[in-house]
């Protein structure tokens, strides 16, 4: 549905989006897995958390993440199509006081301990570009998504509409 540089165009206004209210519209505890059904797991190592993408053994318990959903408002003069638009943004917290953060300089996804209000690096625009899968786009870096690289989460630049459905940026949410 995009032109040549569609991803850059449609995300241009993300920098200026304002999150309406400080409380989430809903929260949802779910396990996170890749399109290929590998689990996203979190391990405490040397007083910091590491994020892994791995196959779990049968009956091994999946790690849960608290997804907090916020509504973000675009005034029509920013949305580019004359319409006041709304989007869903999420924060992801696998354990109390820790949130996934986008480290745009290192192209990495990290767990940081922080207090509310959370920094913009902890917010991701929610997409469901593929049936029953979601993608997470950095609020601070439009066109950059959480993805899987070398069995870790990383930030992946998506430079064309075709790549929006590339499997390594697609995730499944499950309550089980």
């Amino acid at each position: 549905a995009f032109g040549i540089s569609g991803v850059q165009k449609y995300t241009r206004a993300l920098h200026d989006s304002s999150i309406t209210g400080i409380s989430p519209i809903t929260e949802y505890l779910a396990s996170l897995s890749t399109y290929n059904d590998q689990s996203i797991t979190f391990a405490l190592e040397d007083e910091s958390y590491e994020i892994y993408v791995e196959d779990l053994k049968k009956d091994e318990k999946k790690d849960k993440v608290l997804l907090s959903y916020y509504e973000s408002q675009h005034p029509s003069n920013e949305s580019g199509d004359g319409v006041d638009g709304k989007m869903l943004m999420v924060t992801l917290s696998p354990t109390k006081d820790f949130w996934l953060h986008a480290n745009n300089k290192e192209h990495s996804v990290e767990l940081h301990k922080c207090e509310k209000p959370l920094p913009d690096q902890a917010f991701f625009v929610l997409h469901n570009m593929h049936s029953n899968c979601v993608s997470f786009e950095c609020k601070t870096d439009p066109g950059v998504f959480i993805g899987v690289k070398d069995n870790h989460l990383a930030l992946i630049k998506v430079d064309s509409s075709e790549n929006l459905c590339t499997e390594n940026i697609l995730f499944k949410l499950s309550e089980t």
Partner: antibody, heavy 121, light 107 residues
Framework: QVQLQESGPGLVKPSETLSLTCTVS????????VHWIRQPPGKGLEWLGV???????SYNSALMSRLTISEDISKSQVSLKLSSVTAADTAVYYC???????????????WGQGTLVTVSS | DIQMTQSPSSVSASVGDRVTITCLAS??????LAWYQQKPGKSPKLLIY???RLADGVPSRFSGSGSGTDFTLTISSLQPEDFATYYC?????????FGQGTKVEIK
């Protein structure tokens, strides 16, 4: 303002292909998904499929073998084709736009007025 | 597919009455439920999204509650223009199924 307008023949013969077009204005297909929904006379609503903002398409599996959804960005149009129709496909067909940018979680905020398609010989 | 069961299928009420419509999902859908109002010969109109959020321009007498599998639409004080059919819809996973509808009629 946001508008969606369905158009196409009101009468289709059994075994033929039903073709409808949804012409949109006031918003961009690169930001919002457009869905097709139908409603047989006197009955409830049935979701048929969606053209998502990224250009991917999801179908109702019950109709997947007969249904094709496509787009023409330059004309701001989304098309629906339903093949091998029978009398059971007689319905008002609606197109509708997502409430949220990039996702369908917020339901359908804007609807076309609907177009009645009758399948009869 | 997720089945959505609405009850009652119809309700007779008077202006000023409080009306409650319930929707039950066959599996958990989080908060991803919408409610629509449809009048004869018209397109559906979004009333509530994300289970509890009031859509733009919808009067505050409409409210939504619930999460997981059980959801409720409440009209606190029924007005003449509220006589219509109401549908719930789950948006957690495709196909995005609707309830069968609840017709609110004049008593």
């Amino acid at each position: 303002q946001v508008q969606l307008q369905e158009s196409g023949p009101g009468l289709v013969k059994p075994s033929e292909t039903l073709s409808l077009t949804c012409t949109v204005s006031g918003f961009s297909l690169s930001k919002y998904g457009v869905h097709w929904i139908r409603q047989p006379p006197g009955k409830g609503l049935e979701w048929l499929g969606v053209l998502r903002a990224g250009g991917t398409i999801s179908y109702n599996s019950a109709l997947m073998s007969r249904l094709t959804i496509s787009e023409d960005i330059s004309k701001s149009q989304v098309s629906l084709k339903l093949s091998s129709v029978t009398a059971a496909d007689t319905a008002v067909y609606y197109c509708a736009r997502d409430h949220y940018y990039y996702s369908s979680f917020g339901g359908f905020a804007s609807w076309g007025q609907g177009t009645l398609v009758t399948v009869s010989s | 597919d997720i089945q959505m069961t609405q009850s009652p299928s119809s309700v007779s009420a008077s202006v000023g009455d409080r009306v409650t419509i319930t929707c039950l999902a066959s599996q958990t859908i989080g908060a991803w439920l919408a409610w629509y109002q449809q009048k004869p010969g018209k397109s559906p109109k979004l009333l509530i999204y994300a289970a509890t959020r009031l859509a733009d321009g919808v009067p505050s007498r409409f409210s939504g509650s619930g999460s997981g599998t059980d959801f409720t639409l409440t009209i606190s004080s029924l007005q003449p223009e509220d006589f219509a059919t109401y549908y719930c819809q789950q948006l957690n996973s495709t196909p995005y199924t609707f309830g069968q509808g609840t017709k609110v009629e004049i008593k």
